[in-house]
Every structure is written in structure tokens, then in C-alpha cells.
């Protein structure tokens, strides 16, 4: 039992705070924001993690065509409502009263509405589109090496099981990666598309959520895989709920 | 290397209340637990409570509330266990240990005798 | 409160014999198990926790398995100095809760 086992720390999230207080010295993490228990064996919700990032101080053609139903996060950061799981609440409220209903990654899929506004289900987001534009390269990457390296990260880094990436597409300079995972198809256990696509998007901007991990270093075939623009496409399993003059605008 | 001290044995009238210590040396006496168990003669092992002196938040078992208290020094690296209105079960040798992810350094033992 | 039904409550054994305890949770308890070994007069030992870590200076011989809510110690060849208690202990939640021990003698 040596000192380095010694360390109560949450690898899998930097927002929290740890001690060694839990059952027989259980080392137990709580999200900062929240106040909520993590499992550090896993990653932490989005919702959570969201929550935290709120709380901290601030500082400083192969390709697949979005759905129309497709969303993007355009409304960026807020304070999120979270369940006892650490899941988001359907629906979302600012201070000033305005409410709105979100889908299972936390993105505003109804026009936004007063206390009265109802959002009767957590809506799942079943499909993501991660785009990706890498900066300029000597050549193209191989396109079955840059395949196994994202389905390897995805894996390994994120614990993603390999059957949600359901395809990586490359037209150099774009690449794009397709998460699926149905609720039928979700076990126990399993980590959800949209935590680990927030995980990837974190990372790619050199934000990492990782305790003492170095930032992400891709590399396909030792060629640095450098991104240069990310574009998440959000796909629920029930069309959002949008009035015509935001469709048209 | 990590040791707990234990004070020594106890003999006390039925009624009355004893205070026991567990010195630690050896590592940082806040970053860890410090558990209390119980062994009856002939029997088994219990457990007492807990107490991580790095916060001063504690846990009891709920058959020793009003029965056990558990303080901690950190200024003197001691945790102690107050026992109240003894009875001859309370008999029983006393053992402190530092736990840390179920792993535990055990003290050498503090034995409590209630007789009248 | 989570009970821990620990088997046998006694037993001999040979020396060099394979030597199994078990313990048995009345819920899952996600691997949070330790093993104790407690000898007359002396302090309890850690031999494993989390199910199955051996503690850094524990002879080899002694491997912990398990998960949910079944768990054994197993001694794979049995040695003068084994005799004595064995305790399991659960840490999933508060309070803890030992087995009610296995009294290991040599036959």
C-alpha cells in the first residue's frame, strides 16, 4: 500500500473537491457548484460539470448533412438545473424567469417562455455530429488510421463503448465523428454520447476536464491531428419545438 | 512509519465514564479517518465510529450514540474516545485504526474493565 | 444497516492445505470489502481491501475475489503463522459492518 495510492484525488474531474471522509476512508468527490458525489471512475454528467464551470471563477462528399432538426448550442454557457442523477432537468430557467426545455445534453431545443412554459419529458439527443477542421497538413491522414486513433480516444480516454461511434467520415480538411446510442440501447454503466462528446469538445479546446492529464495529444501515424474549428451537431429522438420565425431567421 | 499509540488499560466503576487515546505518528493526521472498533471477549468485532480530523466531521454507529465520542487534537495528533455511563458491557478491549480505502493500521488495543 | 454473513465460523485445516472464507452481503456492496486477520493479544492486520488488493508486505498466499454481494479470502497454502480470526469488513456505507469472523486452527 504505497503513498501514491494515497492521493484523494478524482481523476476524471478537476472541478471537485475530495476527501479521504467517505466509509472506512473512502475517498469521496463532490462537483464543485453542485455539492453533488461523483463517481470517479467514470466521467461526470455534462450537467454537473456545467455547473461547476458556473460556480469556478472566471477567467480567462462523404460528409454527413446536419438534419434539419439538428441542433447547435448556440445559447453557450448557463447555470444549469440538475436531477438527483446529475442529469438536466427538461426544463431550464435564468434568473429573470425565463424558462425554456432542453434535451439530455443540455441544449435549448423550445423557444424560450415563462414560468408557465411546460417541458413534460427530458428529451434524449439519440445522434452527435462532432465537424472537425484540422489545420493544414503536409498531406491527407489516412483515413482507416485517423478512423482507429478517434474510435481508439473515444474508447480509451473517454470509456466510451465502441459500438456508439458509429462512423468517423474524412474529406480533408473535414472530419467528422457520429456518436449514436438509443435509450434502448444505453446498460447500466455505460457513459452517455453527449457527457463524452463534452469531454472531446473540452479537450479539443485545450480545456481539459481531466485531473493532471496532460492536454490531449492526437497524433494519427505520429502526425499531430491539430482542430482548428468544432461545429457539435445534436440530433433528439423527438424534433425540437421551434416556432416558424426562428426557422426562418 | 505510520503508528497509533493507544493509552493504557482502564479499570472503572459501573456509571462512571472513561477517555481513551490514540496518538498517530508517522503521516499527516489530517489528510486521514481514524476508526473505532470494539472486541468483547469471545466475540466479535464492532464498529464504534468514525472521525476525519481534517474536517471534524464524524459517523457513529447508531448503538453508540450517547454512548461513545470521539474528539480529536490536532495540535497533539491524538484522537480520543469517551465512553459514558459504563456497564459491565462495555467491558471490552478498544482498538483505534487509520483507514484509508478500507486499508487500515490498527492501534495496539486499549482495555476497558467495568467493575464495581 | 448492510449484514455480513461470514462461513465457516470455525474450521481446521492442514498446513500447506487451500484454505476458502466467505462472506456474504445482504446487498451489493461495489467491491468496498476488506479482510482482517486477528490473532489473541494482538491488533487486527489488513490482508486485503477492495475485494481484492493484497497490502503491500502480505505474503502472496492470501487473494481476495468477489463482487456484488459474494466475496471470499482464499489462503492458497496454509502456514503456522495463518492461525488465528478472520474478519471481513464492509466500507459501501455507513456503518460498517464486520462478519462475525472465522477461527482458523491446524488440524
Known amino acids: 500500500h504505497t503513498a501514491a495510492q494515497d492521493n484523494c484525488t478524482c481523476p476524471t474531474n478537476k472541478m471537485t473537491v475530495c476527501s479521504p471522509d467517505g466509509p472506512g476512508g473512502r475517498c469521496q468527490c463532490r462537483a464543485l457548484g453542485s455539492g453533488m458525489a461523483v463517481d470517479c471512475s467514470t466521467l461526470t454528467s455534462k450537467c454537473l460539470l456545467l455547473k461547476a464551470r458556473m460556480s469556478a471563477p472566471k477567467n480567462a462528399r462523404t460528409l454527413v448533412r446536419p438534419s434539419e432538426h439538428a441542433l447547435v448550442d448556440n445559447d453557450g454557457l448557463y447555470d444549469p438545473d440538475c436531477d438527483p442523477e446529475g442529469r438536466f432537468k427538461a426544463r431550464q430557467c435564468n434568473q429573470t424567469s425565463v424558462c425554456w426545455c432542453v434535451n439530455s445534453v443540455g441544449v435549448r431545443r423550445t423557444d424560450k417562455g415563462d414560468l408557465s412554459l411546460r417541458c413534460d419529458e427530458l428529451v434524449r439527443t439519440h445522434h452527435i455530429l462532432i465537424d472537425l477542421r484540422h489545420r493544414p497538413t503536409a498531406g491527407a491522414f489516412n483515413h482507416s488510421d485517423l478512423d482507429a486513433e478517434l474510435r481508439r480516444l473515444f474508447r480509451e480516454r473517454y470509456r466510451l463503448h465502441p459500438k456508439f461511434v458509429a462512423a468517423v467520415h474524412y474529406e480533408q480538411p473535414t472530419i467528422q465523428i457520429e456518436l449514436r446510442q438509443n435509450t434502448s440501447q444505453k446498460a447500466a454503466g455505460d457513459v452517455d454520447i453527449g457527457d463524452a462528446a463534452y469531454y472531446f469538445e473540452r479537450d479539443i479546446k485545450g480545456e481539459s476536464l481531466f485531473q493532471g492529464r496532460g492536454g490531449l495529444d492526437l497524433r494519427v501515424r505520429g502526425e499531430p491531428l491539430q482542430v482548428e474549428r468544432t461545429l457539435i451537431y445534436y440530433l433528439d429522438e423527438i424534433p425540437p419545438k421551434f416556432s416558424m420565425k426562428r426557422l426562418t431567421a | 512509519q505510520v503508528q497509533l499509540q493507544q493509552s493504557g488499560p482502564e479499570v472503572v466503576k459501573p456509571g462512571a465514564s472513561v477517555k481513551m487515546s490514540c496518538k498517530a505518528s508517522g503521516y499527516r493526521f489530517t489528510d486521514y479517518v481514524i476508526n473505532w472498533v470494539k472486541q468483547r471477549s469471545g466475540q466479535g468485532l464492532e464498529w464504534i465510529g468514525q472521525?476525519?480530523?481534517?474536517?471534524?466531521?464524524?459517523h457513529y454507529n447508531k448503538n453508540f450514540k450517547g454512548k461513545a465520542t470521539l474528539t480529536a487534537d490536532k495540535s497533539s495528533n491524538t484522537a480520543y474516545m469517551q465512553l459514558n455511563s459504563l456497564t459491565s458491557e462495555d467491558s471490552a478491549v478498544y482498538f483505534c485504526a487509520r483507514f484509508f480505502e478500507g486499508f487500515a493500521y490498527w492501534g495496539q488495543g486499549t482495555l476497558v474493565t467495568v467493575s464495581a | 444497516d448492510i449484514k455480513m454473513t461470514q462461513s465457516p465460523s470455525s474450521m481446521y485445516a492442514f498446513l500447506g492445505e487451500r484454505v476458502t472464507i466467505t462472506c456474504k452481503a445482504s446487498?451489493?456492496?461495489?467491491?468496498?470489502l476488506s479482510w482482517f486477520h486477528l490473532k489473541p493479544g494482538k491488533s487486527p492486520k489488513s490482508l486485503i481491501y477492495r475485494a481484492n488488493r493484497l497490502v503491500d508486505g502480505v505474503p502472496s498466499r492470501f487473494s481476495g475475489s468477489g463482487s456484488g454481494q459474494d466475496y471470499s479470502l482464499t489462503i492458497s497454502s496454509l502456514d503456522y503463522e495463518d492461525v488465528g480470526i478472520y474478519y471481513c469488513l464492509q466500507y459501501d456505507e455507513f456503518p460498517l459492518t464486520f462478519g462475525g469472523g472465522t477461527k482458523l486452527e491446524l488440524k
Open positions: 446487498q451489493g456492496i461495489n467491491n468496498y
Open positions: 472521525i476525519y480530523p481534517g474536517s471534524d466531521t464524524f
